[in-house]
C-alpha cells in the first residue's frame, strides 16, 4: 500500500501567544509529508498545510473565527511525492492533537510600557494595548477588546536606589501611583488573567523602564513627555 512506510506524527503541541497559534509535531519527515486538519467539536474537518515537509502549521486563521470554541487538530502522514488519488481507500496514519481552547489557553505576550508621566508625586504608567489577529467585521481587535475585564495588569515599581519592590494592579491599561519627590523609579508590568487556573495565567514581565530615560521624564513642572 502507499502508506506502509509512513510514520504517524507524534508530540502534537499547540504554541499560541496573543492568539497567534501554531501546531507543532514530530518527527522531521524522511520520505513523507504531512497534511493538517482542524475542527471544532461540532464542526467539519478543514484541511490546512497540504502535503508539507514542515513540522508546524499556522492555524491562526481558523481559530480566530471563534476564540471561545474548543478545537481539535490531526496530522496525516503521506509518502513523499504523494498525489491525492480519488481511488485510494486506505486512510493514512494520523495523530490527534490535544484539545485547544484559544481564549483559555493562548499565552499572554510580553507587555510593553508605552509611556510614563510624572506630575509632582504622582506617576501615570500606561501599558501598550497589543493588537491580535482576532477580527470583528473587518477590524482587528486588541487584547483588551477580546479579554475585556478578564485581563488585568500588575505593575512592579521600585526606587532606582533600592531593591524593595511595590506592586499595583489595574483592570485598565493605566496605573496612577504615588512616588517620593526627587526619587527616580523603575517599572515593569505583567499581564494577568486571574480567572485562569493554569500556568498561562501570567505573561512574562515587560522590559524594565526607568525614570530619567527615554520613555518618560521626572518633571516637577507638570510637563509630560511621551515616547512615540
Amino acid at each position: 500500500s502507499g502508506t506502509t512506510n509512513t510514520v504517524a506524527a507524534y508530540n502534537l503541541t499547540w504554541k499560541s501567544t496573543n492568539f497567534k497559534t501554531i501546531l507543532e509535531w514530530e518527527p522531521k519527515p524522511i520520505n513523507q509529508v504531512y497534511t493538517v486538519q482542524i475542527s471544532t467539536k461540532s464542526g467539519d474537518w478543514k484541511s490546512k498545510c497540504f502535503y508539507t515537509a514542515d513540522t508546524e502549521c499556522d492555524l491562526t486563521d481558523e481559530i480566530v473565527k471563534d476564540v471561545k470554541q474548543t478545537y481539535l487538530a490531526r496530522v496525516f502522514s503521506y509518502p513523499a511525492g504523494h498525489v491525492e488519488s480519488t481511488g485510494s481507500t486506505e486512510e493514512p496514519p494520523y495523530e490527534n492533537s490535544p484539545e485547544f481552547t484559544p481564549y483559555l489557553e493562548t499565552n499572554l505576550g510580553q507587555p510593553t510600557i508605552q509611556s510614563f508621566e510624572q506630575v509632582g508625586t504622582k506617576v501615570n504608567v500606561t501599558v501598550q494595548d497589543e493588537w491580535t489577529l482576532v477580527r470583528r467585521n473587518d477590524t482587528f481587535l486588541s487584547l483588551r477588546d477580546v479579554f475585556g475585564k478578564d485581563l488585568i495588569y500588575t505593575l512592579y515599581y521600585w526606587k532606582s536606589s533600592s531593591s524593595g519592590k511595590k506592586t499595583a494592579k489595574t483592570n485598565t491599561n493605566e496605573f496612577l501611583i504615588d512616588v517620593d519627590k526627587g526619587e527616580n523609579y523603575c517599572f515593569s508590568v505583567q499581564a494577568v488573567i486571574p480567572s485562569r487556573r493554569t500556568a498561562n495565567r501570567k505573561s512574562t514581565d515587560s522590559p524594565v523602564e526607568c525614570m530619567g530615560h527615554e520613555k518618560g521624564e521626572s518633571r516637577e513642572t507638570g510637563h509630560h513627555h511621551h515616547h512615540h
Epitope: K41, D66, K68, Q69, T70, T101, Y103, L104, T126, V127, D129, R136, L141, S142, R144, D145, V146, F147, G148, K149, D150, L151, N171, T172, N173, E174, P194, S195, R196, R197
Partner: antibody, heavy 120, light 113 residues
C-alpha cells in the same frame, strides 16, 4: 442555538435556602461567564455576580456576598445560584445570563428567569 | 461603585416618534487603551428577560433593528429610537460593563401616549 433554561418557580419560608439552576446549550459552556441578575417585583435590575465555569472563578456584588453562592457543573453545562437564610426581600425573579463574545460586551443571552417567593 | 442614572424615568410617546433616553455614569466608562466605552443598553418587556440592544456604547447587537442607536463617551450616553414601532414600548436599562461591580441604571419606562 444558544439557550439558557432555568429551573422552575420556588416558594420558600424565611430562613430556608434555595438553589436555582441554569442549563446552558448551544455554545462552549466553559469559556463564557454566567451572570446572575436579581429583579424584585416592579423594580429594576441588580447584578449579583458571575462565575466562569472553566475555573470556577467568581465575582460577587458586595450586597450578596455571604448569602449567595455561585457554582457550575461543567459535565452537565449547568450553573447554579444558591441563596441561604432567605428573607422576604429575596422575593424576586432571578435571571442567569451569558456574557458576550467580545470583552465587556454585555449580557448577550438570558434565561427565562426563576421566580423565588419567600413567605411564611 | 459606579452609579448609573437614567433620565427620564418614564416617557410617553407615539408610534413614529423619535425618542432619546440618556444615561449618566458617576465615573468614566472610557477605556483609554482601546478607546471603547463599556456602556450597554437593554430592552425589557413585562414578564420577559432583558434583551441586549447595544454594547460598547454604540455597537448594535446582531439582529437589533437599525432604528436603535447608541452614542456618547466618558460619562454621558444616549439611546435613540429613530422612529418608534409598537413593539418598542418597554423599559430600557443602561449598564456599566466597565468595572466590577457591574451596575444598572434604574430604567426608563417607555409608554404609549
Amino acid at each position: 442555538e444558544v439557550q439558557l433554561v432555568q429551573s422552575g418557580s420556588e416558594l420558600k419560608k424565611p430562613g430556608a435556602s434555595v438553589k436555582v439552576s441554569c442549563k446552558a446549550s448551544g455554545y462552549t459552556f466553559i469559556t463564557y461567564w454566567i451572570e446572575w441578575v436579581k429583579q424584585r417585583p416592579g423594580q429594576g435590575l441588580e447584578w449579583m455576580g458571575d462565575i466562569l465555569p472553566y475555573s470556577g472563578s467568581t465575582n460577587y456584588n458586595e450586597n450578596f456576598k455571604g448569602r449567595a453562592t455561585f457554582s457550575a457543573d461543567t459535565s452537565v453545562s449547568t450553573a447554579y445560584l444558591q441563596i441561604s437564610s432567605l428573607k422576604a426581600e429575596d422575593t424576586a425573579v432571578y435571571y442567569c445570563a451569558r456574557s458576550g463574545y467580545y470583552g465587556n460586551s454585555g449580557f448577550a443571552y438570558w434565561g427565562q428567569g426563576t421566580l423565588v417567593t419567600v413567605s411564611s | 461603585d459606579i452609579q448609573m442614572t437614567q433620565s427620564p424615568s418614564s416617557l410617553s410617546a407615539s408610534v413614529g416618534d423619535r425618542v432619546t433616553i440618556t444615561c449618566k455614569s458617576s465615573q468614566s466608562l472610557l477605556s483609554s487603551s482601546n478607546q471603547k466605552n463599556y456602556l450597554t443598553w437593554y430592552q425589557q418587556k413585562p414578564g420577559k428577560a432583558p434583551k441586549l440592544l447595544i454594547y460598547w456604547a454604540s455597537t448594535r447587537e446582531e439582529g437589533v433593528p437599525s432604528r436603535f442607536s447608541g452614542s456618547g463617551s466618558g460619562t454621558d450616553f444616549t439611546l435613540t429610537i429613530s422612529s418608534l414601532q409598537p413593539e418598542d414600548f418597554a423599559t430600557y436599562y443602561c449598564q456599566n460593563d466597565y468595572t466590577y461591580p457591574l451596575t444598572f441604571g434604574q430604567g426608563t419606562k417607555l409608554e404609549i401616549k
